[in-house]
């Protein structure tokens, strides 16, 4: 499945909305920082397969749409960024759910999909845990908002990559 | 709010197949993936698999390959759980529920459904 | 896989009692993705507690959670008369995920 351009640039664009969406300085949270293992493995450009880095894309996107879609989210960020952003979220999701549509029924990367998939998953789940630790402080947010750049600019360069590859 | 109302009861003989729905409310579909956990008479809870409604990616429980195929629809906003080759230990109640995370992992449940598997 | 087994199968205790329901897990499970569920006779199972120590929304303070590895217990502190029900715990940190055997709580 080719992934098309438009996939590439939404995600820029994403990225862009992302860093607009700051509010506060991100040196006036270091002492909120955190490390929230973001499953690089997954996406190892060395041993990971198509199919796979595939199916995490689209579960990342997901899980990061669902986390910017909270109430508590909606209370932390403009408004129309947000929405924005969901557009952009959401014009990925389509597109890679084409993908990983047409990768459905391969059985010999399917444990390996699940893996990819629950590593993700738990990555989010640790993002989810950190908000609701700091009670979603407007600190915390930036770290997550920061934590969501950094995970969305990996995959960004890595889907540079998968075309290449194609 | 999120509901999630599954198909009645069932009794199917030996050897057939049967297939329990589950339609959700409340919530975008798509976002959330859905996962089906049974129950046997007097016995514990037993993950089965989960589907991804928003493209179909499936992951089943090793001991249900094979004999289980989840499925959805999205214009209903459902989702359907069929086991082929029923046997008598088949029969249990089957519940969908709700993925997401934190406090949202498995927070909204199916009522369940009696699926009786006799001669 | 990963196999939960609760401790002991039957508690009988009387309401104002302290009940304390054990789970343990035969290889690691990190507490992010260790959760008890209570089932009543009929009922769906509902979330008690997740990520080994939360409450989940309009559970009672009554109900604690704690343990990490491989060793995880559920605590009521004074027993309510609502509270007698089956206790599961439930992992999510490794495919197949699993639910232990269950605890059954009776009124003594």
């Known amino acids: 499945c080719d992934l098309p351009q438009t996939h590439s640039l939404g995600n820029r664009r994403a990225l862009i909305l992302l860093a607009q969406m700051g509010r506060i300085s991100h040196f006036s949270c270091l002492k909120d920082r955190y490390d929230f293992g973001f499953p690089q493995e997954v996406f190892d450009g060395n041993q990971f397969q198509k199919a796979q880095a595939i199916s995490a894309f689209h579960e990342m996107i997901q899980q990061t749409f669902n986390l910017f879609s909270t109430k508590d989210s909606s209370a932390a960020w403009d408004e129309t960024l947000l929405d924005k952003f969901y557009i952009e979220l959401f014009q990925q999701l389509n597109d890679l759910e084409a993908c990983v549509t047409q990768e459905v029924g391969v059985e010999e990367i399917a444990l390996m999909n699940e893996d990819s998939i629950l590593a993700v998953r738990k990555y989010f789940q640790r993002i989810t845990l950190y908000l609701m630790g700091k009670k979603y402080s407007p600190c915390a947010w930036e770290v997550v908002r920061a934590e969501i750049m950094r995970s969305f600019s990996f995959s960004t360069n890595l889907q540079k990559g998968l075309r290449r590859k194609d | 709010q999120v509901q999630l109302v599954q198909s009645g009861a069932e009794v199917k003989k030996p050897g057939a197949s049967v297939k329990v729905s589950c339609k959700a409310s409340?919530?975008?579909?798509?976002?959330?993936?859905m996962h089906w956990v049974r129950q046997a008479p007097g016995q514990g809870l037993e993950w089965m698999g989960e589907?991804?409604?928003?493209?179909?990616?499936?992951i089943y429980a090793q001991k249900f390959q094979g004999r289980v195929t989840m499925t959805r629809d999205t214009s209903t906003s459902t989702v359907y759980m069929e086991l082929s080759s029923l046997r008598s230990e088949d029969t249990a109640v089957y519940y969908c529920?709700?993925?997401?995370?934190?406090?949202?992992?498995?927070?909204?449940w199916g009522q369940g459904t009696l699926v009786t598997v006799s001669s | 896989e990963i196999v939960l087994t609760q401790s002991p199968a039957t508690l009988s205790l009387s309401p104002g009692e302290r009940a304390t329901l054990s789970c343990s897990a035969g290889?690691?499970?990190?507490?992010?993705?260790l959760y008890w569920y209570q089932q009543k006779p009929g009922q769906a199972p509902r979330l008690l507690i997740y990520?080994?120590?939360n409450l989940a929304s309009g559970i009672p303070a009554r109900f604690s959670g704690s343990g990490s590895g491989t060793d995880f217990t559920l605590t009521i502190s004074s027993l309510e008369p609502e509270d007698f029900a089956v206790y599961y715990c439930?992992?999510?940190?490794?495919?197949?995920?699993?639910f232990g055997q269950g605890t059954k709580l009776e009124i003594k």
């Open positions: 529920a709700r993925g997401g995370l934190g406090p949202a992992w498995f927070a909204y």
């Open positions: 409340g919530y975008t579909f798509t976002n959330y993936w």
């Open positions: 589907i991804n409604p928003s493209h179909g990616r499936t």
């Open positions: 290889s690691s499970v990190d507490s992010s993705y």
């Open positions: 990520s080994t120590s």
């Open positions: 439930h992992q999510w940190s490794s495919y197949p995920f699993t």
